[in-house]
Interface confidence: low
């Protein structure tokens, strides 16, 4: 193993950890022969887990299936067989378990029904799966039931006949509110957006669909767009890609008022074989990927202004495969403004890039300390870290997990990677950053599954192996020191780690199966780390940490998007519980403005290595294809616009004469009443 010491060794004194963990390890053997297992957490901090096991035998004419349903209310330590609550019915795994939002306690399971039935069947629970009610549906569902984020009693579903069905009483009664529906989504305030086909079918009418909205669950409707190819919601933005009049290209239009008014996004149009993709969106802005023409496998990332209209080029040659639809774009949720993705270079090698300022600037990931550059590096002393994400996983490289970060584990990022000039196909190692991606260190040798517990107080890992395993590794100091714990004397074929979403739990469940000559038996081991972190953390266990600090001498050190944040973080040497109620303590302070806090407004751009915005020469004296709210519009600008989410105050204010940009609206999208409005310039 590359000369490294045996991985079963560890460091860091945690007295009697073996005895403490042995007393807190709970095994559950599932008494069935199922081929697959799915697991869902019900609610937050409830400890309730539902496990659905399915066993399917394909017969000549039909397939015979059997499901079993198990429930735990102690974070997986014990399970009870509750299959009788669903009348021993076979549950369709492709619909999964539809768990209600927040702590509603609602669960919907979709059952398999015989061929001639009038409609589908669901089992509904609103008490965290203690009881289920069987309900026969007046339609056959095509998709999983979708809960309204605002009211978990409101559900929508599409039928196999493309009907849009709505329930106002948690699936007890259903009403078909529209036919010929292709795609439906909940928006804010219980609004439903959906596209309909007018002539033939969803596929045939692609680019000729209509976008509709209902704000009262189907009593009244408004057509908010025509010639639609597709639509999406991101943050406070509603996006639609709309076919152009003259050719087969399409453009993105944006609305921030639920589709009442639309503006054409200043993004390149795309042809039939290309696509747009919303990579990330929040209340302030959006990252948009625009595919390159041809089957290149890459495109360009653009970042928007606060209106979602004006876009700045953020990153060229952004890897996004057309075939599998894979991109490595990752929001590092443990530090504001940080994103990691991959680019495809001219020689077809893939390289990782990171931004710390929400797409303003991208750079390579710093080489981990004490690491050697691999065979991909031209210069053996200068190289960078490259992160494996979705694309590597799709290519069946030895990467069991995508990068991991948690908002309440400040600064921690864990990912598989390699050190060189590009991503390597060699077996990766696991790397960790404790400062949001500025610096990295090798955490574990070889591929692992990993998860964060107790808001970063514990990191757990299991080696990725095709052999049965019985060792779990854990660290109480953000991945520096690792202890190994043998959780069972009988190794299991490992299938997954499960911990409660949100990384606040101290329990981890190790799932797998034992296999004899003809039978496979599912088993879970739940390890509770509460006795390892045996005391609650106190004030002295935390230390202050300035995020994004790169130059402590500079008064602007730590300033990102106009403000800096100081966090209280657990000391690495403190072995204590953050606890379930832990709230990240942060102290923001506003920074003075500089040109870096502004993006260039429409009609302006920043020349390479310059900080000032200058007027785009090709736009001088031209009519501009720009459509703001679809009205005749005179747009005034001084060429600068504050970056979305930027909170800087004082300092530099880019003052220059305000120009009148006469715009010509050439979009024929918009609402029928507003179409083709023009202004002469």
């Amino acid at each position: 193993r590359r000369g490294a010491p045996a991985e079963d060794q560890d460091c860091g004194r945690l007295p009697d950890f073996i005895a403490k963990l042995t007393n807190n390890t709970h095994q559950h053997v599932f008494d069935d022969l199922s081929g697959s297992v799915s697991l869902s957490w019900v609610g937050d901090s409830t400890g309730v887990i539902l496990v659905l096991t399915t066993f399917q035998v394909p017969l000549v004419i039909v397939s015979f299936g059997q499901s079993k349903l198990y429930r735990s209310e102690d974070y997986g330590k014990n399970f009870k067989d509750i299959t009788n609550l669903i009348n021993n019915t076979f549950i369709r795994t492709e619909f999964g378990m539809a768990i209600g939002p927040e702590n509603s306690g609602k669960v919907i399971l979709t059952a398999e029904v015989s061929g001639g039935s009038r409609g589908g069947r669901v089992f509904r629970s609103s008490d965290f799966a203690k009881n289920f009610v069987q309900t026969d549906l007046p339609f056959h569902p095509l998709t999983q039931m979708m809960y309204s984020p605002q009211n978990s009693d409101y559900l929508l579903a599409l039928s196999t006949e493309n009907g849009l069905w709505v329930s106002k009483n948690f699936g007890e009664k259903w009403e078909e509110i529209h036919k010929a529906v292709c795609l439906a989504k909940w928006g804010p305030n219980n609004i439903i957006f959906f596209t309909t086909h007018v002539n033939g079918s969803c596929k045939a009418d692609l680019g000729a669909l209509e976008l509709w909205r209902t704000s009262d669950l189907g009593k009244t409707f408004k057509t908010i767009g025509v010639k639609i190819y597709s639509f999406g919601l991101g943050g406070r933005f509603l996006f639609a890609s709309v076919m152009a009049d003259k050719d087969t290209t399409r453009r993105i239009h944006v609305s921030t008022d639920q589709g009442d008014t639309w503006s054409m996004a200043q993004l390149p149009s795309v042809g039939q074989e290309q696509f747009y993709s919303i990579l990330a969106a929040n209340e302030d802005m959006v990252f948009m990927h625009v595919d390159e023409p041809g089957d290149t496998g890459f495109g360009t990332i653009f970042t928007s202004d606060d209106r979602g209209i004006v876009y700045s080029k953020s990153l060229d040659r952004h890897l996004y495969t057309t075939t599998g639809g894979e991109t490595d774009f990752t929001n590092v949720t443990s530090l504001r403004g940080v994103y990691i993705t991959s680019t495809l270079s001219e020689d077809n090698s893939i390289q990782s890039m990171i931004t710390f300022d929400q797409g303003g600037r991208w750079e390579h990931l710093r080489k981990p300390e004490n690491s050697k550059c691999d065979a991909t590096a031209k210069n053996k002393n200068e190289c960078s870290l490259h992160i494996h994400a979705s694309y590597s996983i799709s290519q069946k490289l030895n990467v069991p997990m995508a990068p991991l970060s948690e908002p309440n584990a400040v600064g921690i990022v864990i990912a598989h990677g390699s050190v060189g000039d590009a991503i390597s196909v060699m077996v990766p190692d696991v790397y960790i950053s404790d400062d949001g991606g500025y610096s990295w260190a090798k955490m574990l040798e070889g591929p692992h599954y990993y998860t964060i517990l107790d808001s970063g107080g514990i990191i757990v890992a299991i080696e990725h192996s095709n052999r049965p395993i019985n060792v779990i590794k854990f660290s109480t100091d953000e991945g520096q020191c690792w202890q190994s714990y043998v959780f069972t004397q009988e190794p299991i074929y490992f299938t997954g780690l499960a911990s409660e979403p949100g990384a606040r739990s101290m329990n981890i469940s190790i799932w797998g199966f034992t296999e004899s000559f003809i039978t496979r038996q599912w088993v879970s081991y739940t390890v509770d780390f509460k006795d390892i972190l045996e005391r609650n953390c106190e004030e002295d266990d935390y230390t202050t940490w300035l995020a994004h600090s790169t130059d402590p001498g500079d008064y602007k050190d730590g300033c990102i998007l106009g403000y800096k944040e100081q966090f209280l973080r657990l000391r690495k040497s403190s072995v204590c519980q953050n606890g379930r109620d832990y709230v990240v303590a942060k102290q923001p302070s506003v920074c003075p403005c500089s040109l870096e806090d502004f993006l260039c407004d429409f009609g302006y751009f920043r020349p390479e290595n310059a900080s000032e915005c200058v007027e785009q020469p090709e736009l001088k004296g031209h009519e501009l294809e720009f459509c703001l709210y679809g009205k005749e519009e005179h747009l005034t600008t001084n060429g600068y616009r504050k970056i979305p989410g930027d909170k800087c105050q004082g300092g530099m204010n880019p003052a220059r004469e305000v120009k009148d940009l006469k715009k010509k609206c050439t979009s024929n999208f918009l609402n029928p009443t507003k179409q083709n409005s023009k202004s002469n310039s």
Partner: antibody, heavy 129, light 107 residues
Framework: QVQLVQSGAEVKKPGASVKVSCKAS????????MSWVRQAPGQGLEWMGI????????SYAQKFQGRVTMTRDTSTSTVYMELSSLRSEDTAVYYC??????????????????????WGQGTTVTVSS | EIVMTQSPATLSVSPGERATLSCRAS??????LAWYQQKPGQAPRLLIY???TRATGIPARFSGSGSGTEFTLTISSLQSEDFAVYYC?????????FGGGTKVEIK
Amino acid sequence: QVQLVQSGAEVKKPGASVKVSCKASGYTFTSQYMSWVRQAPGQGLEWMGIINPYGGSTSYAQKFQGRVTMTRDTSTSTVYMELSSLRSEDTAVYYCARDPSGIAAAGPASRYYYGMDVWGQGTTVTVSS
Amino acid sequence: EIVMTQSPATLSVSPGERATLSCRASQSVSSNLAWYQQKPGQAPRLLIYGASTRATGIPARFSGSGSGTEFTLTISSLQSEDFAVYYCQQARLGPWTFGGGTKVEIK
């Protein structure tokens, strides 16, 4: 109190094997690693390897790979070190030492190496024809 | 493997004087370093771990410093019982390795 008691002195012929025992008391035997270190007459200390008494897993120095075997008996809280194919240069005092930190899996250095904090009294092994 | 080099091999010091012992690693061992004292006919005794932390029961006249590749053990005022051989040991990467030792003798 915490102590490690080793077996008595041994005289062996070249080519033979020797098995030294180290009995631990005063702490939870399976919770701490155990290293073996030897010292030839008038020479310095040489680390031979380490054993995890809980799982029984081991890691040996390359020099001793294939000749050394470290085992443990949890029922008696004893670790054993067996060295085979003895040669005259194996004449040394052999120590077991509790090593609470074990070996870092990889990557970021442990900020907490605790050292070998408890040592056995040593076992003299003489290899002579 | 990481090679640990101690200097000087022998240090002659009068009682009450200060003794400074050096240990250099062939590559960074971070702070994964320990110091031991060994007297003739006895097993080694742990003095310092983590490069700078005194082990339980070790007098305050012993102090350790350094990280990475350069380390120092300082005995601020030598007592008669301090004349012995001192070894440094790294635990950054397996195999653990010891320095050749520094013998502190009475001047």
